[in-house]
Structure formats: structure tokens, C-alpha cells
């Protein structure tokens, strides 16, 4: 079955923030804050006509 | 530490997943610079599909 | 049009180092991926590793890493491979190979090989 | 790391017979499945690029196809001038293995 759509499941770190229970809530300035700049930090990485977008962000202790 | 855990919709056969990997890690230094996010433990797979009910790019 | 000329064939004793240039002409060197394989006589093809010009990002297979570097000069328009303690298993032609652009996963330009000999 | 199995490691055949190569990769390549040629003496040249995407200038007597882990080269009528050896490349993941090749003959 090709749906002419491509996904990557993608992990990473952020070393210099600290987690605390409001990632675990979309609706606080925090998340929100953090998913924005994840959002605008991948569409400058993948620049090219390729990337269709990013879904499912998920935060974690690290 | 914070762990991040998303997924990236791609057109077919426009990257594969080592160009993936590598293009986010060469970013790393500007996300500092820029985001002030200090990153660090990238790891990049590819997604069988369908692999969840709620995959949507965007 | 787009031409890679390697240089010439190489004998070399145990234990000595050599380097192999591949000149680029006919396209702007700095947005090409270039590729390095091996051809040991009447083997098949084994990748080593690449460059990108533009960042002199490299990578290379595993089990190159401590065998090949991987260098390019851009304002000659050549990258370079040199091979470290060159051992009898290390005789073979060796071929640089450009990357297509853009979301282009393959090897669409080559050049002629370079045959490093290695013997005492 | 992907290994890549190719088979058969040599073959022979007559001239306008239809000729079959597989390709076997350890894990899904996505398509990322390039197929060369070499001629004795000389570097190789790309075939086919994306599994089934023939590069300018390749006659179309060759097509490649393929998903997932298995992929093929055919030869639908063998000409004198396709004695070669014919090499699979993963292009999904690094290291960026090739089969171990395919060797083509005329009987």
C-alpha cells in the first residue's frame, strides 16, 4: 500500500530545560511556547519541497 | 532534561532517513543560537504504516 | 558537461599513505553530494563514504573510518581521499561518484577509478 | 547495518530472452533502490533510480520494480551489447551497501 507519504518517528533531548507537569498540559504557556518553537525549528530545517509537516509531539522526562 | 518525541511527514521518495537524521543534526548549533535549545541524543526511525489513527502531517 | 577525472594509478608500499584527488568540471562543485567506492580486483562494490563540498560535512561507513579521509578543496573544484596504512587488502580501484541533487538518491555521474596497488 | 542479497551471482543467456535479477534487502528500503551496470574495464553507470525509475538514455527494453525488501531488474529482450555486471544499491540508510553483483553472459 503506497500512500505517497513518508513518516519518521524522531527523539530528542533538549538538555537545557527542565520538564515540570505543565508539558504534560497542551493548554499551558509552557507547552505551547515549546511546541511553537519546535514547529518553526523544523520547517527551517526541512526547508525543501519535501516536508509536509510534523503531528503527535509528545514531551517527556528526560 | 526534556525528551521530545514527534513524527514527519515527507512526500515519498523525497528524503530517506539518513538525510533526515543528518540535516536535523547539523541544525543543532542554530537551534541553540536561535531557540536557546541545547540538543543533544537524536535518534530518527522510520514509521511502519499505518502507525497510528492519528497521523496526520500538520 | 559534468566530467570527474581521477588521478593516476598508485603503487605503494605496506604501511604508506596515499591520496586520490577527483576533479569536478561541468557543474557547481559545492551543491553535489561526492561518494567514494572500492573495487578490490574481480570484487564487487563496497561504499565508503561521502562528502559535501559546500559544508565539508563527511560521513563515512564504519568500517572505513580509521582507513579514508574524506577532503575537498573548493576553489579547485576536487575532493580527495587519502588512505592510511595502506595494507595488501587495500589494493583496489577506487572511484569517486557524485550525487544527484535535490532528492536524487543515486550515483548519476562517476568517475574513471583510480587503481591503488599496495605491495612490497 | 542493510544487507543487500542479489541473485543470481551470474547468469547466462540468449540474445532476446527475458532476463530477471532480484535484489533482497534485510530491511524495508523504501524504494531507495538503485540498480548500475558496469561493463568489464570501466566504471559503473545508473540504470535505474527510486526502483523503477529509468535514468535519460537507458533503453527501455530494462525496467526495474519492487517494494519494501524485494526488488528486480529485467531485461525484456537481452541485446549482445547488456553483458555486464549488475549492481543493486540501498540508498535508504547508511552504510549505503551494494549487492554483491550480478554477472550477465550471452550463451
Known amino acids: 500500500l503506497s500512500t505517497g507519504v513518508s513518516f519518521f518517528f524522531l527523539s530528542f533531548h533538549i538538555s537545557n530545560l527542565q520538564f515540570n507537569s505543565s508539558l504534560e498540559d497542551p493548554s499551558t504557556d509552557y507547552y505551547q511556547e515549546l511546541q511553537r518553537d519546535i514547529s518553526e525549528m523544523f520547517l527551517q530545517i526541512y526547508k525543501q519541497g519535501g516536508f509536509l509537516g510534523l503531528s503527535n509531539i509528545k514531551f517527556r522526562p528526560g | 532534561s526534556v525528551v521530545v518525541q514527534l513524527t514527519l511527514a515527507f512526500r515519498e521518495g523525497t528524503i530517506n532517513v539518513h538525510d533526515v537524521e543528518t540535516q536535523f543534526n547539523q541544525y543543532k548549533t542554530e537551534a541553540a543560537s536561535r531557540y536557546n535549545l541545547t540538543i543533544s541524543d537524536v535518534s530518527v526511525s522510520d514509521v511502519p504504516f499505518p502507525f497510528s489513527a492519528q497521523s496526520g502531517a500538520g | 558537461q559534468v566530467q570527474l577525472v581521477q588521478s593516476g594509478a598508485e603503487v605503494k608500499k605496506p604501511g604508506a599513505s596515499v591520496k586520490v584527488s577527483c576533479k569536478a568540471s561541468g557543474y557547481t562543485f559545492t551543491t553535489y553530494t561526492m561518494h567514494w567506492i572500492k573495487q578490490a580486483p574481480g570484487q564487487g562494490l563496497e561504499w565508503i563514504g561521502y562528502?559535501?563540498?559546500?559544508?565539508?560535512?563527511?560521513h563515512y561507513n564504519q568500517k572505513f573510518k580509521d582507513k579514508a579521509t574524506l577532503t575537498a578543496d573548493k576553489s579547485a573544484s576536487t575532493a580527495y581521499m587519502e588512505l592510511s596504512s595502506l595494507r595488501s587488502e587495500d589494493t583496489a580501484v577506487y572511484y569517486c561518484?557524485?550525487?544527484?541533487?535535490?532528492?536524487?538518491?543515486?550515483?548519476?555521474?562517476w568517475g574513471q577509478g583510480t587503481l591503488v596497488t599496495v605491495s612490497s | 547495518d542493510i544487507q543487500m542479497t542479489q541473485s543470481p551471482s551470474s547468469l547466462s543467456a540468449s540474445v532476446g530472452d527475458r532476463v530477471t535479477i532480484t535484489c533482497r534487502a534485510s530491511?524495508?528500503?523504501?524504494?531507495?533502490l538503485v540498480w548500475y551496470q558496469q561493463k568489464p574495464g570501466k566504471s559503473p553507470k545508473l540504470l535505474v533510480y527510486n526502483a523503477k525509475t529509468l535514468t535519460d538514455g537507458v533503453p527501455s527494453r530494462f525496467s526495474g520494480s519492487g517494494s519494501g525488501t524485494q526488488y528486480s531488474l529485467t531485461i525484456s529482450s537481452l541485446q549482445p551489447e547488456d553483458v555486464a555486471t549488475y549492481y543493486c544499491q540501498n540508498f535508504w540508510n547508511v552504510p549505503f551497501t551494494f549487492g554483491s553483483g550480478t554477472k550477465l553472459e550471452i550463451k
Open positions: 530491511g524495508n528500503i523504501h524504494n531507495f
Open positions: 561518484a557524485r550525487q544527484g541533487n535535490y532528492a536524487a538518491y543515486y550515483f548519476d555521474y
Open positions: 562528502i559535501n563540498p559546500g559544508s565539508d560535512y563527511t
